[in-house]
């Protein structure tokens, strides 16, 4: 018969023959022959292969380096890599999460639109008219200006995006 030019799913072509790939969690030791099946071996401790493969070496589990602010979010298995995340107050610098940086704080005049997570930084927004923030914070939203009217007071000093309004007593009409 004609040697194959393509193989079925979970097979690979070698020496004009279709051999079975090794299942996830196992590596290739020897190719199949006309008389023998593909020989595979389980990955060792702290190693993994996450797909049907013909790799002769397993991948090392990712190391979540605490010196880079990393910690283990999910321990790796023979079929999955370790997933790292960042310590509290820090977030990953890339999709692969290889290092962490401190969450940014929103400066006075800006409030937190979205609090940071282990994988995304703080998102700040400028305080709109009627709101202010007088602190640098990774958690504080813009606060509304104090309503002097509800306290039977009047505005003595207008608010800005960084300061609250200053309320004072209403001027008494002189006799």
């Amino acid at each position: 018969p004609e040697p194959p030019t393509a193989c079925r799913e979970k097979q690979y072509l070698i020496n004009s023959q279709c051999c079975s790939l090794c299942q996830p969690g196992q590596k290739l030791v020897s190719d199949c022959t006309e008389f023998t099946e593909t020989e595979c071996l389980p990955c060792g401790e702290s190693e993994f292969l996450d797909t049907w493969n013909r790799e002769t070496h397993c991948h090392q589990h990712k190391y979540c380096d605490p010196n880079l602010g990393l910690r283990v979010q999910q321990k790796g298995t023979s079929e999955t890599d370790t997933i790292c995340t960042c310590e509290e107050g820090w977030h990953c610098t890339s999709e692969a999460c290889e290092s962490c940086v401190l969450h940014r704080s929103c400066s006075p005049g800006f409030g937190v639109k979205q609090i940071a997570t282990g994988v995304s930084d703080t998102i700040c927004e400028p305080c709109p008219v009627g709101f202010f923030s007088n602190v640098s914070s990774a958690f504080e939203k813009c606060h509304p200006w104090t309503s002097c009217e509800t306290k039977d007071l009047v505005v003595q000093q207008a608010g800005t995006n960084k300061t609250d309004v200053v309320c004072g007593p209403q001027d008494r009409l002189r006799a």
């Epitope: 030019t5 393509a6 193989c7 799913e9 979970k10 097979q11 690979y12 072509l13 790939l21 290739l28 030791v29 020897s30 190719d31 292969l49 996450d50 797909t51 049907w52 493969n53 013909r54 790799e55 002769t56 070496h57 397993c58 991948h59 090392q60 890339s94 999709e95 692969a96």
Partner: antibody
Framework: CQSLEESGGRLVTPGTPLTLTCTVS????????MTWVRQAPGKGLEWLGL?????SAYYASWASGRFTISKTSTSVTLKMTSPTTEDTATYFC?????????????WGPGTLVTVSS | AIVMTQTPSSKSVAVGDTVTINCQAS????????LAWYQQKPGQPPKLLIY???TLASGVPSRFKGSGSGTEFTLTISDVVCDDAATYYC????????????FGGGTEVVVK
């Protein structure tokens, strides 16, 4: 220091067999898959084939039968059985990241093969 | 065979700007992330920038960022510098296909 160096590239006439050699230093061929990639003048990169740590060779469909990859303990060879003018290119020997056959982190400088009558 | 299609073929960018290069695989790469990005300058061999779609290779500046999964991938270069002028290639891998590895056609980045 881990390095690769290709040799054997020269001007040959069509049909004249040619063997390119990749000499490795600083690492063991029992730990790394080795791949050949070529690049025709002014063109893109083309994956040719690889030989893995247990000595199994895999080829691009267009390269099967036209090229043979083999290795010793310190070198990898690419034999061009019957070159044509379309095989004129710089041939790179490359090393993969362990376990990642498509991620080539060490490249040789390349050797130029010119096939012309 | 897995086929990699890169767009655009050429891109002109100013210093300090951000450039995005796309790479599409004809079928899902292994583990949905077996994709690498390379940078090549004239007269030099290519240099590995990113592997497994988003992992930065040793010594590569964090201005280079890889993202994507399955069949759609992106290389983003932010704060472009003159030294980034080069041709960039993606390469995908799928063990079940005869042509297990394949390169994209390349994207030339010109820095103004």
């Amino acid at each position: 220091c881990q390095s690769l160096e290709e040799s054997g590239g020269r001007l040959v006439t069509p049909g004249t067999p040619l063997t390119l050699t990749c000499t490795v230093s600083g690492f063991s061929l029992s730990t790394y898959d080795m791949t050949w990639v070529r690049q025709a003048p002014g063109k893109g990169l083309e994956w040719l084939g690889l030989i893995n740590t247990i000595g199994s060779a895999y080829y691009a469909s267009w390269a099967s039968g036209r090229f043979t990859i083999s290795k010793t303990s310190t070198s990898v060879t690419l034999k061009m059985t019957s070159p044509t003018t379309e095989d004129t290119a710089t041939y790179f020997c490359v090393r993969g990241v362990p376990g990642y056959s498509s991620s080539f982190n060490i490249w040789g400088p390349g050797t130029l093969v010119t096939v012309s009558s | 065979a897995i086929v990699m299609t890169q767009t655009p073929s050429s891109k002109s960018v100013a210093v300090g700007d951000t450039v995005t290069i796309n790479c599409q695989a004809s079928e899902s790469v292994d583990s949905n992330k077996r994709l690498a990005w390379y940078q090549q300058k004239p007269g030099q061999p290519p240099k590995l920038l990113i592997y497994t779609a988003s992992t930065l290779a040793s010594g590569v500046p964090s201005r280079f960022k890889g993202s994507g999964s399955g069949t759609e991938f992106t290389l983003t270069i932010s704060d472009v510098v003159c030294d980034d002028a080069a041709t960039y290639y993606c390469a995908g891998y799928k063990a079940t296909t005869t042509d297990a590895s394949a390169f994209g056609g390349g994207t030339e980045v010109v820095v103004k």
